[in-house]
């Protein structure tokens, strides 16, 4: 295939591909007819002027994981018809100016994990059709003023993973078409008003794992088109009322992992494509009425591992479509009787890992097709005569770890749960805690002297034994098991989508088996 | 391009045990819940259940608890699924696919990996 | 868990002619605002492929002769006119509860 190097294979489709630690320079002679070159996993350590001069075809070339920290200006010279370039995972600290000099076609610049220290305005001024830039994983401490301004058709850039500080205002404010912007995993400490003002086609907006305390009211008030805004493991104590207004397309917001002690109503503003939305570890004390009235369409709220202790009755108006809540490891103590009054399509709620006294009797009354309750480890000592008698699909009810008081009043629910036995699961049953000679015993099969008032039961319906939610030990009791979600080793990956994050924490979502896929 | 590629098919012993993987690419995917679908030989779908990749939390359908478990290696975007004490009517085309939120229809499908258990 | 009935099993329609296939759902899967019905397409030796979400919406990227419609427990996909690259089977799925299919639809050519 017009001369392919020994250490290298090469196809009929005019791709070459050199690998191999026995490699330490850009392998000759090269097809001349080559389109697509990959340099992997080499211990080559520079580059130095013209290695590609033979093979001006050339479209796409990666170099990738290997010992390069050295390039001259003009390595990349006669590429005029490349169009992906990728230098990623490498040892580079320095880019020379002028590297990228007669690229004119290219549009795909990768240079992530690296070394590269700084940028300068000069290294892509000569990229006018560059659309994409991954500058991830690098030791960027600060973007200059002036270093994007030419990349005016750029539609991606990735400066997630480095050290940044801090991000001048005015250093996006010619990229009008850029879709993408990732600054994840960096030590910035607050965004400047009017930063992302000129992004008018944003899409995405990862902004998640810095140290960020406060957002400008107006901080994205431009951005008309986001989709998808991440803002998780900050120092974001407030959201001013209005920050998130202007987001009418948004699909995805993550907040968890913040410091945010309350949210005001309607801060949520209308956003019909919004439909999983997760705060859990913050310190969110109280919810006030009408806190999520805007969010029509949302499917699964979770809102464990805060600090809530108070829930207005109002508090879910306009959550119609909720499917899953996720209250569990919280300060809740006491629940008003309306509080989910409007969740009709609620299928999930957890609720364990509290300070739960008393249920009302009509806490669950317009919530027929809830599935899975979760309640164990509070304080409940009993529960109200026919709390779950209307709930005809309720396949798993977790009542574990609480305080039952096993006198005479405990008889109705006592009878009720032999009845729907199969219902509690298999792996921990509810015990009695007083009176004292019978502590410890299971509630289900104790034997209290006195008449059993007849109790009508509904008949139990026929749902598998454990319904079908996550599986997964229950936080912070890792001792008891209540089948909730499968939460590992924290996550790497740099974004943390509208999902959990955690080191060892070994529950968040909380809910049981018999949520929907 | 939004792609999900599939490990090759396998010929399995009943009794043992075969681990799919699925290869994502051309999207965030950590951002998006990756559902595994059953086929068997002429047969309709079947869901197994769904791994939400960035809290590795999963959901089965009761009857594939104890047959299959979903895990995923978010440092190569690449999830699995684990088929133990395999019988011949494990055999089947398995999909993975991606959707959007959890009660999302599944955008995006692999290619399908075929596992044949014959003694 | 939800069963889901397909009619007809299989149906031959002429080129440029509408098909029309209905699934039932044993209890409701709707809310005031959304369906969680869903329709997939799958061809000989290939994955399926969504058609339809949310009883109506259609996927990008789909003909606009695929349309669906219905709520509660009665659905219906049609094809206004349809073409040869249109022989497949066709599945409707309910993410309401745990994920279910219906058994299949097989649209031919007559």
């Known amino acids: 295939y017009h001369g392919c190097p020994s250490e290298c294979t090469c196809s009929r489709a005019s791709q070459v591909e050199c690998t191999g630690a026995r490699i330490v320079a850009v392998p000759t002679p090269l097809p001349w007819n080559a389109m697509s070159l990959q340099i992997l996993n080499t211990h080559i350590t520079e580059l130095n002027e013209s290695p590609f001069l033979n093979i001006s075809a050339l479209i796409a070339l990666r170099i990738e994981k290997n010992e390069l920290s050295r390039i001259t200006p003009g390595a990349f010279r006669n590429l005029g018809s490349l169009r992906y370039l990728s230098l990623a995972n490498n040892k580079l600290q320095v880019l020379p100016i002028g590297l990228f000099q007669g690229l004119d076609s290219l549009e795909s610049l990768l240079l992530s994990s690296n070394q590269l220290l700084q940028i300068q305005p000069a290294h892509f001024s000569q990229c006018s059709n560059l659309k994409e830039l991954q500058l991830h994983g690098n030791h960027l401490e600060y973007i200059p003023d002036g270093a994007f301004d030419h990349l005016v058709g750029l539609t991606k850039l990735n400066l997630g993973k480095n050290s940044l500080t801090h991000i001048s205002p005015r250093v996006f404010q010619h990229l009008g078409n850029l879709q993408v912007l990732r600054l994840y995993e960096n030590r910035l400490t607050d965004i400047p008003m009017g930063t992302f003002d000129g992004l008018v086609n944003l899409q995405e907006l990862a902004l998640q794992q810095n140290q960020i305390g406060l957002l400008s009211p107006g901080l994205f008030h431009n951005n008309h088109n986001l989709q998808r805004l991440y803002l998780s493991n900050n120092h974001i104590s407030q959201l001013p009322p209005s920050v998130f207004m202007q987001l009418p397309q948004l699909n995805r917001l993550t907040l968890f992992g913040n410091s945010l002690k309350e949210l005001s109503p309607g801060i949520f503003g209308p956003m019909p494509n919004l439909r999983e939305l997760w705060l859990y570890d913050n310190h969110i004390s109280s919810l006030p009425d009408n806190v999520f009235s805007n969010l029509r369409q949302l499917q699964v709220l979770i809102l464990s591992r805060n600090q809530i202790s108070f829930i207005s009755p109002g508090a879910f108006n306009g959550l119609t479509e909720l499917r899953e809540l996720s209250l569990h490891t919280n300060a809740l103590q006491d629940l008003d009787g309306n509080v989910f009054r409007m969740l009709a399509n609620l299928q999930n709620i957890s609720l364990q890992n509290n300070r739960l006294r008393q249920l009302p009797g009509n806490i669950f009354a317009n919530v027929n097709g809830l599935m899975a309750i979760q309640l164990q480890n509070n304080q409940l000592e009993n529960l109200p005569l026919g709390i779950f008698d209307h709930l005809g699909k309720l396949c798993e009810l977790r009542l574990y770890d609480n305080p039952w008081r096993c006198d005479s009043d405990i008889l109705p629910l006592r009878n009720w749960l032999l009845l729907n036995q199969p219902r509690l699961g298999t792996d921990t049953v509810p015990v009695c805690f007083s009176p004292a000679n019978v502590r410890g015993q299971s509630l289900i099969i104790i034997n209290v002297n006195v008449a059993v008032p007849s109790v009508h039961v509904p008949e139990v319906p026929s749902y598998p034994e454990t319904p079908w939610y996550p599986d997964t030990p229950s936080y912070p009791d890792t001792t008891s098991v209540s089948s909730t979600t499968e939460l590992t080793s924290p996550v790497e990956d740099y974004t943390d989508l509208t999902t959990i994050q955690v080191t060892d924490d070994r529950s968040v979502w909380g809910m049981t088996q018999a949520q929907s896929g | 391009e939004v792609q999900l590629v599939q490990s090759g098919a396998e010929v399995k012993k009943p009794g043992s045990s075969v681990k799919v993987s699925c290869k994502a690419s051309?999207?965030?995917?950590?951002?998006?819940?990756i559902h595994w679908v059953k086929q068997a030989p002429g047969q309709g779908l079947e869901w197994i259940g769904l791994?939400?990749?960035?809290?590795?939390?999963?959901n089965y359908n009761q009857k594939f608890k104890g047959k299959a478990t979903l895990t995923v290696d978010t440092s190569t975007t690449t999830a699995y699924m684990e088929m133990s004490s395999l019988r011949s009517e494990d055999t089947a085309v398995y999909y993975c696919?991606?959707?959007?939120?959890?009660?999302?229809?599944?955008?995006?499908w692999g290619q399908g990996t075929t596992v044949t258990v014959s003694s | 868990d939800i069963v889901l009935t397909q009619s007809p099993d299989s149906l031959a329609v002429s080129l440029g002619e509408r098909a029309t296939i209905n699934c039932r759902a044993s209890?409701?899967?709707?809310?005031?605002?959304?369906?969680?019905m869903h329709w997939y397409q799958q061809k000989p030796g290939q994955p399926p492929k969504l058609l339809i979400k949310?009883?109506?919406s259609l996927e990008s990227g789909v003909p606009d002769r695929f349309s669906g419609s219905g709520s509660g427990t009665d659905f219906t996909l049609t094809i206004s006119s349809l073409q040869a690259e249109d022989v497949a089977v066709y599945y409707c799925e309910q993410s309401w509860e745990i994920r279910t299919f219906g058994g299949g639809t097989k649209v031919e050519i007559k």
């Open positions: 209890q409701s899967v709707s809310t005031s605002s959304y369906s969680y």
């Open positions: 696919a991606r959707g959007d939120n959890k009660y999302d229809a599944m955008d995006y």
């Open positions: 949310y009883a109506s």
């Open positions: 791994v939400y990749p960035y809290i590795h939390g999963t």
């Open positions: 051309g999207f965030t995917f950590t951002d998006y819940y």
